[in-house]
């Protein structure tokens, strides 16, 4: 059964920069990537980014910067706001439509106890939500 | 027909701040992302950045962070682009063009709004 | 910022030739680059999206090619009409970037 994994990093220099990681752990070639935060995409969720792995990237503030890490994962910057910790309690989500899957979610936040430059361990949270 | 009609020209002076309009007709309004686009005389084009009408989610070019500022009306159907603490190199033509996310390209743009900054 | 380079300010042409516009990025964007027409005095207009397809209603003597970090944009059987600055866009990255522009001009 594919899975997909979500990691959130709060930056040891910045304490108020974080970085959102996923990726997608199964057969199949990913077809998009939507990142939202306040959870999951269409279901209270706020889009904060669309990947396309060849026509690019949309991306709403907070995001800073989206991009492919690898052909299964991605990154998600988030903008200094200021304040410290200000995505702390944060959920972020990602789903990958994937073919012939179907689509895949996933959300995480950083770890309460996190210290800066940890993050939360690669372990997907699934949200059941297979199209 | 889906058109996009912006606000006509407009001269002002350095130091202060301008709205341009950008109403869009013949499509659902918030169905599509709006973008704005700069074009200094005789230049090419800078991205300036885009906002989602559904929810006013924006994404600025960090070039114009501190210049523009991107707002919608749903009710009329508008997105409006608010310019700041104008100088003369903020003179060009104004473009805002719709954002087709089914195929990723800008697929309408509107005629544009000259902005000429002199004292 | 990923830097798209029109090399070709200026291309001179004569209306029923073969003309080919390029355009090259600064790091490898896949296909994620259009075409936009800007006739004098007019505002931009899309050709090309995605690398290759046309936009709705642009005549098929406009072709789009490439993917990576080279794109193409041509025009078979220039007419009087295509005069016009070109312009390519990638949307790979934020922010996204246009390329200066290519004047062509008809003989």
């Known amino acids: 059964t594919p899975e997909v994994w979500v990691q959130v990093q709060m930056e040891a220099t910045e304490l108020s920069s974080f970085t959102v990681h996923c990726g997608f752990l199964g057969p199949g070639s990913i077809s998009l990537v939507t990142v939202s935060w306040g959870g999951p995409d269409g279901a209270g969720g706020t889009k904060l980014a669309v990947l396309h792995p060849e026509l690019g990237t949309r991306q709403w503030a907070p995001a800073r910067q989206a991009r492919w890490e690898t052909q299964s994962s991605i990154s998600l910057a988030l903008e200094d706001s200021g304040a410290s910790s200000p995505f702390a309690n944060t959920t972020f989500c990602c789903k990958f439509a994937s073919f012939p899957e179907g689509s895949w979610e996933s959300c995480g936040s950083l770890p309460p106890s996190s210290d800066p430059g940890l993050s939360a361990p690669p372990t997907p949270v699934p949200i059941l939500r297979a199209d | 027909e889906v058109q996009l009609q912006q606000s006509g020209p407009e001269l002002v002076k350095p130091g202060s701040s301008m709205k341009i309009s950008c109403k869009a007709s013949?499509?659902?309004?918030?169905?599509?992302?709006m973008d704005w686009v700069k074009q200094s005389h005789g230049k090419s084009l800078e991205w300036i950045g885009a906002?989602?009408?559904?929810?006013?989610?924006?994404s600025y070019n960090q070039k114009f962070k501190d210049k523009a500022t991107l707002t919608v009306d749903r009710s009329s159907s508008t997105a409006y682009m608010e310019l700041r603490s104008l100088t003369s190199e903020d003179s060009a033509v104004y473009y805002c063009?719709?954002?087709?996310?089914?195929?990723?390209?800008?697929?309408?743009w509107a005629t544009g709004t000259t902005v000429t900054v002199s004292s | 910022d990923i830097v798209m380079t029109q090399s070709q300010k200026f291309m001179s042409t004569s209306v029923g030739d073969r003309v080919s516009i390029t355009c090259k990025a600064s790091q490898n964007v896949r296909t994620a680059v259009d075409w936009y027409q800007q006739k004098p005095g007019q505002s931009p207009k899309a050709l090309i999206y995605?690398?290759?397809n046309r936009h709705t209603g642009v005549p098929d003597r406009f072709t789009g090619s490439g993917s990576g970090t080279d794109f193409t944009l041509t025009i078979s059987n220039v007419q009087s009409e295509d005069l016009a600055d070109y312009f390519c866009?990638?949307?790979?990255?934020?922010?996204?970037?246009f390329g200066g522009g290519t004047k062509l001009e008809i003989k």
């Open positions: 906002i989602n009408p559904n929810n006013g989610g924006t």
């Open positions: 063009a719709r954002w087709d996310s089914d195929y990723w390209y800008f697929d309408v």
């Open positions: 013949g499509y659902t309004f918030t169905d599509y992302s």
């Open positions: 866009l990638q949307h790979w990255n934020y922010p996204y970037t």
């Open positions: 995605s690398a290759s």
